[in-house]
């Protein structure tokens, strides 16, 4: 199809070589058409456009994305670029930063239902550049955390070095939907709830004498609880003696609850004490058996192929540790009578 009639938008993605960040393109079809598509309609229900030339579908994934090869070859279906570029609803997600993502991307409805619809398309010229070291040293991260129940803020990474006074007007999106009231380089959250978690996009316009570009950044915002102030506790074994049968195989499970920590490095291991000696046992990998917002339960088993008389003289110790401290629980084996 002829893309000369498509509306054009220029975007700039300046990525940090230090972080694993992603980027998105929205299918910004001309305003009346957009309302049929991506549900990012800026119109209030009362502001119905006078005419709707594009009779699109309500199916959110009903747009087609293409990539325009730089050598002038025909347009390529974006699905050829899978899994580096992924379409979700009307949004194109770029999973890996790199200058090779620079180029032209075209979106249009899949279903062309009237002569007007042929020109119902958008061409996005994307320029991708690595961030120069000269730019801001302390720019906001592309992964930001908000503490549940407290106040917090979400900063636009590409503008975080500028003061609110000198910052240009910013357009914010959350999970692809326009946040129409937010216009500054920082979103202030009075009280953080779980629903504040999501993918935020901030856009602002940068102009030079020749043209203007939309500078875009993507921020993944996580809602978290505060770091625990407690060392882990062992939920199992509870008893310090265990009745066993000699000659039979035995599995002893150690289950421990670890409170949430942003930097989470849990330790759970088994060791054996035999008179004055003690040594760590090679046991199967630990596994997470339950994970909630506040804590995680991790299990690690020690397996004895068969219980011997010598095992009855030993103590089997489960050791767990986080950044706050450690806890141990020892088990003495006792022959079943």
């Amino acid at each position: 199809f002829n893309i000369s009639g498509c509306s054009t938008k220029k975007l700039l993605w300046t990525y940090s070589t230090r972080s694993e960040e992603e980027f998105v393109l929205f299918c910004d079809l001309p305003e009346p058409q957009k309302s049929h598509f991506c549900h990012r309609n800026r119109l209030s229900p009362k502001q119905v456009p006078e005419h709707l030339p594009f009779m699109g579908s309500n199916d959110l994934s009903d747009v087609q994305w293409y990539q325009q090869p730089s050598n002038g070859d025909p347009l390529e279906d974006i699905r050829k670029s899978y899994p580096h570029i992924i379409q979700d609803k009307c949004t194109l997600h770029f999973l890996t930063p790199g200058v090779n993502n620079s180029g032209s991307y075209i979106c249009r409805p899949k279903m062309i239902k009237s002569p007007y619809d042929v020109a119902c398309c958008v061409k996005m010229i994307l320029e991708v550049k690595p961030q120069t070291n000269a730019s801001c040293e302390y720019s906001a991260s592309h992964k930001q955390d908000l503490l549940l129940g407290s106040t917090g803020s979400i900063s636009c990474p590409s503008l975080s070095c500028q003061s609110d006074a000198q910052s240009p007007a910013v357009t914010w999106y959350k999970n692809g939907k326009l946040l129409s009231v937010e216009r500054s380089n920082r979103i202030v959250v009075d009280e953080v709830y779980d629903y504040h978690q999501g993918t935020y996009v901030c856009d602002y316009t940068q102009s030079d004498t020749v043209s203007s570009w939309t500078v875009r950044a993507v921020v993944q915002v996580r809602t978290i609880v505060g770091d625990t102030k407690l060392k882990p506790d062992i939920l199992d074994p509870v008893e310090d003696t265990l009745e066993v049968e000699l000659g039979k195989p035995l599995t002893i499970s150690c289950k421990a609850r670890f409170g949430f920590e942003r930097v989470f490095n849990p330790v759970i291991k088994w060791y054996i004490k035999d008179s004055d000696l003690e040594w760590e046992v090679s046991v199967p990998e630990a596994k997470s058996i339950k994970s909630t917002l506040k804590d995680e339960i991790i299990e690690r088993n020690i397996i004895l192929e068969k219980v011997t008389q010598r095992d009855l003289r030993r103590k089997f110790v489960c050791f767990v540790q986080n950044s706050i401290g450690n806890t141990t629980q020892s088990v003495q084996l006792k022959e079943k009578r």
């Epitope: 694993e20 994934s61 609803k89 999970n175 779980d194 993944q220 917002l293």
Partner: nanobody, 117 residues
Framework: QLQLLESGGGLVQPGGSLRLSCAAS?????????MGWYRQAPGKGRELVSS???????NYVDSVKGRFTISRDNSKKTLYLQMNSLRAEDTAVYYC??????????LGQGTLVTVSS
């Protein structure tokens, strides 16, 4: 923290079928993300086999197109992979993970699929 737990792997003969499931621990995280199935064959790197967007759009690598079907149930916080016409080269550990979103990079512990006669 997001926990993903896969199930449904096993030993199957060439041409057979399996259905993998993956349960997530947080619904707020699950529904807005592009979720996917990765696999890692012995001695090879991990590859993204298929993904599904929050709106239901699906993608597959060429080697599984027409044989594998990905689906999701947001109300149950569960991701599925229906694998038909399985081949020996599909043998791998299959992981469910977040492809795009807040917990991008989070993976389950994996479920082994072995295709052998």
């Amino acid at each position: 923290q997001l926990q993903l737990l896969e199930s449904g792997g096993g030993l199957v003969q060439p041409g057979g079928s399996l259905r993998l499931s993956c349960a997530a621990s947080r619904s707020i995280t699950f529904s807005h993300n592009v979720m996917g199935w990765y696999r890692q064959a012995p001695g090879k790197g991990r590859e993204l086999v298929s993904s599904i967007g929050s709106g239901g759009s699906t993608n597959y690598v060429d080697s599984v197109k027409g044989r594998f079907t990905i689906s999701r149930d947001n109300s149950k916080k569960t991701l599925y992979l229906q694998m038909n016409s399985l081949r020996a080269e599909d043998t791998a550990v299959y992981y469910c993970g977040v492809v795009v979103g807040v917990y991008r990079g989070s993976l389950g512990q994996g479920t082994l699929v072995t295709v052998s006669s």
